[in-house]
């Protein structure tokens, strides 16, 4: 018979034949042959593989480093990685939760809608037209543009979401 060019789901092609992939939680020891099945071995303690695979090494479980404020939210198994979270009152810097911050700051152009608490991180909002923020802050709201008119001045430079307007003297009519 013709050697296969593609294999079924949960199989892989090697040496012109289809071998079974190793199930999650196991790694490949040896490929199948004409006469033998794929040989797989369970991952060791603190290791995992989360897909049907032909990996020869299992992945190490993530380490939740307490020096970075991390703790284990969910212990890893042979099929799943460890999930880290931050100590109470702290917040993950990313979805992967690789480090912790007390709270995040809102970038220039954004103001603080709600200051962080023990359970929720800072909530930022974009500065609307007429408001600006030129700093990174965990407490400052967007500030309204300066009103040049109330100072008997005119707008020399328009404001943006990151900068205030620049006011200047009114042009005097020449006689």
């Amino acid at each position: 018979p013709e050697p296969p060019t593609a294999c079924r789901e949960k199989q892989y092609l090697i040496n012109s034949q289809c071998c079974s992939l190793c199930q999650p939680g196991q790694k490949l020891v040896s490929d199948c042959t004409e006469f033998t099945e794929t040989e797989c071995l369970p991952c060791g303690e603190s290791e995992f593989l989360d897909t049907w695979n032909r990996e020869t090494h299992c992945h190490q479980h993530k380490y939740c480093d307490p020096n970075l404020g991390l703790r284990v939210q969910q212990k890893g198994t042979s099929e799943t990685d460890t999930i880290c979270t931050c100590e109470e009152g702290w917040h993950c810097t990313s979805e992967a939760c690789e480090s912790c911050v007390l709270h995040r700051s809102c970038s220039p152009g954004f103001g603080v809608k709600q200051i962080a608490t023990g359970v929720s991180d800072t909530i930022c909002e974009p500065c609307p037209v007429g408001f600006f923020s030129n700093v990174s802050s965990a407490f400052e709201k967007c500030h309204p543009w300066t009103s040049c008119e109330t100072k008997d001045l005119v707008v020399q430079q328009a404001g943006t979401n990151k900068t205030d307007v620049v006011c200047g003297p009114q042009d005097r009519l020449r006689a």
Epitope: N67, L68, G69, C86, E87, W90, S99, C100, V101, L102, H103, R104, S105, V135, S136, S137, A138, F139, E140
Partner: nanobody, 116 residues
């Protein structure tokens, strides 16, 4: 790497005053937003007060408004918290924090006990 060292805590009677200091080493605090945060025994972290990098804007939690004053002296690389009219519920370990507020910047804190 910045290190923050809080000091000035102690035992004080209700109605008394204390001034906390936070001295930074290894990095300047100039231009950086700074916070005072506290943790009462068996409670979570509470954000008490903050000051902008310029010193022009401040924030106070409702629980300390009118009693606490935050200030900074960038030439001394130090943040302060003046605490007046202290109450039993102000008893906590007080920490200072510097933008970007990483856990590994966290100091040891200074314990404030308000008791008669």
């Amino acid at each position: 790497e910045v290190q923050l060292l809080e000091s000035g805590g102690g035992l004080v009677q209700p109605g008394g005053s204390l001034r906390l200091s936070c001295a930074a080493s290894g990095s300047t605090i100039a231009g950086y937003e700074m916070w005072w945060v506290r943790q009462a025994p068996g409670k979570g972290l509470e954000r008490v007060s903050a000051i902008s990098g310029s010193g022009g804007s401040t924030y106070y939690a409702d629980s300390v408004k009118g009693r606490f004053t935050i200030s900074r002296d960038d030439s001394k690389n130090t943040l302060y918290l003046q605490m007046n009219s202290l109450r039993a519920e102000d008893t906590a370990v007080y920490y200072c924090a510097k933008d970007p507020y990483s856990f590994d910047y966290w100091g040891q804190g200074t314990l404030v006990t308000v008791s008669s």
